[in-house]
Interface confidence: medium
């Protein structure tokens, strides 16, 4: 019996289409595949950012695969051909590995890249990113922000920079159509007559950096002699009610502070007839049903009741 062998894929490479971290891994079929024409040849692909402990592994019949990477680090990948057992009348046959790497040659020292990059998607409507200039860079240094997400033909540059002392220190983004629930890639690079500036790459999903507006229309209603219902309305904007969590802070007679987290726009408070003053504030955050993370809104305006029988009056601010 002659041992069945198969060659590794040819021309295995990582292709950067200019999408700031979204890369193509591509290869060509191995030589001498015609012996297995009746067979579905598969490829096992492993890849990772250099420094990562774990490989991502996929098995595919295609000749390409796409994924997002951190371009602040290098990328390594390897691939081999798989012949399923059905093709070989026995066990699965694997080729040797073909390997490739990719990295962007870094310019400038790490300290020149932007510091403290912070991006917030205000009320799921307006994306704003801000940063501080690199350490020790001169005033002639300017930073430029580029972004891409699936749906754009190519990476776009920020057109509305926030400036301080003539330097770009942030970007106000335009309306970003169909941009949530997918990776959003950013590169901030820089230029200086004095010295090269290191680029920085960032990836996040917009729904995970949403900072909603605070809730509005806070009200009290006496439900019974010992219960008061606190109510509020969701903030104006595109975020549906099902996406909110709320945190309430309640102060009774300047003594008791109650803090609670709730999923609905109401909270029932146990109280006594002796309560002379009641104040509460609420803030909102996108919940786990709509995102993996989020930022608490600012607190709402404070709503207080003072010196009247709550059973006789509903207060509306």
């Amino acid at each position: 019996d002659t041992e069945i062998k198969v060659n590794p894929p040819q021309d295995f490479e990582i292709v950067d289409p200019g999408y700031l971290g979204y890369l193509y891994l591509q290869w060509q079929p191995p030589l001498s595949l015609d012996h297995f024409k009746e067979c579905t040849v598969e490829y096992e692909l492993k890849y990772r950012n250099i420094g990562s402990e774990t490989w991502k592994t996929i098995i595919t019949k295609n000749l390409h695969y796409k994924d997002g990477f951190d371009l602040n680090k290098g990328i390594e990948a390897k691939i081999h051909t798989l012949l399923p057992w059905q093709c070989t009348n026995g066990s699965e046959v694997q080729s040797s590995w073909a390997e490739t790497t990719y990295w962007i040659s870094p310019q400038g020292i790490p300290e020149t890249k932007v510091q403290d990059m912070d991006c917030v998607y205000y009320n799921w409507q307006y994306l704003l990113c801000s940063w501080k200039p690199g350490i020790g860079v001169l005033l002639d240094t300017n930073y430029n922000l580029f972004y891409w997400y699936e749906g754009l033909d190519h990476a776009l540059q920020c057109v509305d920079y926030i400036k301080a002392d003539g330097q770009n220190i942030g970007c106000r983004f335009p309306y970003l159509e169909a941009s949530d629930y997918k990776d959003f890639y950013i590169c901030v690079n820089g230029s200086s007559e004095n010295k090269p500036i290191r680029s920085s790459y960032f990836t996040f999903q917009l729904q995970n950096i949403v900072k909603p507006l605070p809730p509005v229309y806070l009200t009290f209603t006496r439900e019974s002699s010992c219960e008061i219902k606190l109510k509020w309305s969701i903030p104006l904007g595109p975020i549906p009610a099902r996406c909110f969590d709320y945190e309430i802070e309640i102060r009774e007679d300047d003594t008791t502070l109650v803090t609670a987290t709730v999923e609905n726009e109401t909270y029932t408070l146990k109280t006594t007839n002796e309560t002379r003053q009641l104040c509460f504030v609420v803030r909102s955050k996108v919940n786990i049903y709509c995102s993996d993370d989020g930022i608490w809104s600012e607190w709402s305006d404070k709503q207080c009741w003072e010196g009247e029988d709550l059973s006789k009056k509903t207060l509306l601010r």
Partner: antibody, heavy 122, light 107 residues
Framework: EVQLVESGGGLVQPGGSLRLSCAAS????????MSWVRQAPGKGLEWVAT????????YYADSVKGRFTISRDNAKNSLYLQMNSLRAEDTAVYYC???????????????WGQGTLVTVSS | DIQMTQSPSSLSASVGDRVTITCKAS??????VAWYQQIPGKAPKLLIY???YRSTGVPDRFSGSGSGTDFSFIISSLQPEDFATYYC?????????FGGGTKVEIK
């Protein structure tokens, strides 16, 4: 419509240089290997050079090795052939061709440009 | 390097005829052979790849067969638009060479 359009051909003296360009449209350029194939007047087809989809792998015919350089710019959907130390025998129509790829085969040429004529003569 | 020897170099035929062109590789190329049609003054056009697979939009009167070193290309019923030069090419490994061509002329 998938299209390849060559440019840059012309008359050049022996020992001279020329740069051919090929503009691609109608397909994802970065997904395919690309080649140059030439045809001398009244003769058959001769493969010249191939560059892989990402540009990492390059292959040349022995007849042009060391004189010609193939390159690509995926951002511009463009393929190039830099021809130096040209000889009379390099006179030909130069075609830009896309490398077809199926799950089991590759390196055939499934889309061709209209060609650009290079004449090397004193 | 793998050489591709194509025969005949030319042939005369009439509309409706069956035409066969052969190509012999100097070493085993599996089924990695393509066939092209070139009309004078035009770019070549892919007809067959991997010895027997028709390219998109190619009429079924064109067919290919063979493996290893011997390959055939057949036009089952020659049409007026088929008078052209036909080339074989191996797409096995670099350098990717063409046959010398077969000119199909009107009898």
């Amino acid at each position: 419509e998938v299209q390849l359009v060559e440019s840059g051909g012309g008359l050049v003296q022996p020992g001279g240089s020329l740069r051919l360009s090929c503009a691609a449209s109608g397909f994802t350029f970065s997904r395919n290997g690309m080649s140059w194939v030439r045809q001398a007047p009244g003769k058959g087809l001769e493969w010249v050079a191939t560059v892989s989809s990402g540009g990492s792998y390059i292959y040349y015919a022995d007849s042009v090795k060391g004189r010609f350089t193939i390159s690509r710019d995926n951002a511009k959907n463009s393929l190039y052939l830099q021809m130096n130390s040209l000889r009379a025998e390099d006179t030909a129509v130069y075609y830009c061709a896309r490398q077809g790829t199926t799950a089991l085969a590759t390196r055939f040429f499934d889309v061709w440009g209209q060609g650009t004529l290079v004449t090397v003569s004193s | 390097d793998i050489q591709m020897t194509q025969s005949p170099s030319s042939l005369s035929a009439s509309v409706g005829d069956r035409v066969t062109i052969t190509c012999k590789a100097s070493q085993d190329v599996g089924t990695a052979v393509a066939w092209y049609q070139q009309i004078p003054g035009k770019a070549p056009k892919l007809l067959i790849y991997s010895a027997s697979y028709r390219s998109t939009g190619v009429p079924d009167r064109f067919s290919g067969s063979g493996s290893g070193t011997d390959f055939s290309f057949i036009i089952s019923s020659l049409q007026p638009e088929d008078f052209a030069t036909y080339y074989c090419q191996h797409h096995y490994s670099a350098p990717w060479t063409f046959g010398g061509g077969t000119k199909v002329e009107i009898k």
